[in-house]
């Protein structure tokens, strides 16, 4: 099969207003070359969440622990979440076209949910 | 165990072409991205060509665009480098390489020695 | 392109005592965390051979002495205690998502 696989194990997340949320995200290959982006929601409506090589998202960082040969990890965390994050996000592989890149495949979804921060 | 074995290597007057084959035994070869690299005493180790696992996908580095065409066939578990207009340049030992993320190299041929000259 | 550059040159290390062969990239390799750095063994007369991945993975059946550490454009592999089954040419090797993948010039290490 030649399309790579986007893997987002996590139907859904919760956490605490307050507190950081790991999306998870994993591919079986870098091949068709492309960068890989978080959105939040889906369609032309979707909010672009992060993108390592350009933008500045100061409330992301990317969290890698998979060190599986067959697993490339493109996983990230959100500090200080607020209600406001709560929604769907979205792994994105595009592959590298002319002028723009190609939205090449999707992973399923995680869906954030944020509880109120303990009293 | 895996295996990798090339074929098709040769001398070549400059402009003239060569086909490499590459055999692969001993894993799904149709799950893996394949590479060619290739080796001069000169210039060190260098990528040639990468195709995708399902073989819609090829890339190459600028010094062998337009020249180099790779293909496979997942059925015969083999992998092919078409090598056109050849140069003096290209005069190196051809080794095939597999990806199975399409990342590093996991394994490798032994080679196949090409040499291009008049 | 990414050009890497490995130092030393070559190497000569006493049989038990540690090898430190250093890559270092004109620009980063690292993608969400992952450093897409790896690195190879060549001996005369045959293929490179994989031992580590992603900057500090040991691939399977490479005995432990061998180890590989750094990010973004600075990286290391290291080989402790070195054995006389070393010798050999290292090689570091990028696969960041730019084209074209690139090589080191390599490392030769010898027994002193």
């Known amino acids: 099969e030649d399309e790579l696989q986007v893997i987002q194990p996590e139907k859904s997340v919760s956490v605490a207003a307050g507190e950081s949320a790991t999306l998870r995200c994993a591919m079986t290959s870098l091949i068709p070359v492309g960068p890989i982006m978080w959105f939040r929601g889906a369609g032309a409506g979707r909010e672009l969440i992060y993108n390592q090589k350009e933008g500045h998202f100061p409330r992301v960082t990317t969290v890698s622990e998979l060190t599986k040969r067959n697993n490339l990890d493109f996983s990230i965390s959100i500090s200080n979440i607020t209600p406001a994050d709560a929604g769907t996000y979205y792994c994105v592989k595009f592959r590298k076209g002319s002028p723009d890149d190609v939205e090449f495949k999707s992973g399923a979804g995680t869906e954030l949910s944020v509880r109120a921060k303990p009293s | 165990e895996v295996q990798l074995v090339e074929s098709g290597g040769g001398l070549v007057k400059p402009g003239g072409s060569l086909r490499l084959s590459c055999a692969a035994s001993g894993f799904t070869f149709s799950s893996y991205v394949m590479s060619w690299v290739r080796q001069t005493p000169g210039k060190g180790l260098e990528w040639v060509a990468t195709?995708?696992?399902?073989?819609?996908?090829?890339y190459y580095p600028d010094s062998v665009k337009g020249r180099f065409t790779l293909s496979r066939d997942n059925a015969k578990n083999s992998l092919y480098l078409q090598m056109n207009s050849l140069r003096a340049e290209d005069t190196a030992v051809y080794y095939c390489?597999?990806?199975?993320?399409?990342?590093?190299?996991?394994?490798w041929g032994q080679g196949t020695t090409v040499t291009v000259s008049s | 392109d990414i050009v890497l550059t490995q130092s030393p040159a070559s190497l000569a290390v006493s049989l038990g005592e540690r090898a430190t062969i250093s890559c270092r990239a004109s620009e980063s390799v690292d993608l969400y965390g992952t450093s897409f750095m790896h690195w190879y063994q060549q001996k005369p007369g045959q293929p490179p051979k994989l031992l580590i991945y992603r900057a500090s993975n040991l691939e399977s059946g490479v005995p432990d002495r061998f180890s590989g550490s750094g990010s973004r454009t600075d990286f290391t592999l290291t080989i402790n205690p070195l054995q006389a089954e070393d010798v050999a040419t290292y090689y570091c090797?990028?696969?960041?998502?730019?084209?074209?993948?690139?090589f080191g010039g390599g490392t030769k290490v010898e027994i002193k």
């Open positions: 090797h990028q696969s960041s998502d730019e084209l074209p993948w690139t």
């Open positions: 390489a597999s990806q199975l993320t399409g990342s590093e190299f996991d394994y």
């Open positions: 195709i995708s696992s399902g073989g819609t996908y090829t």
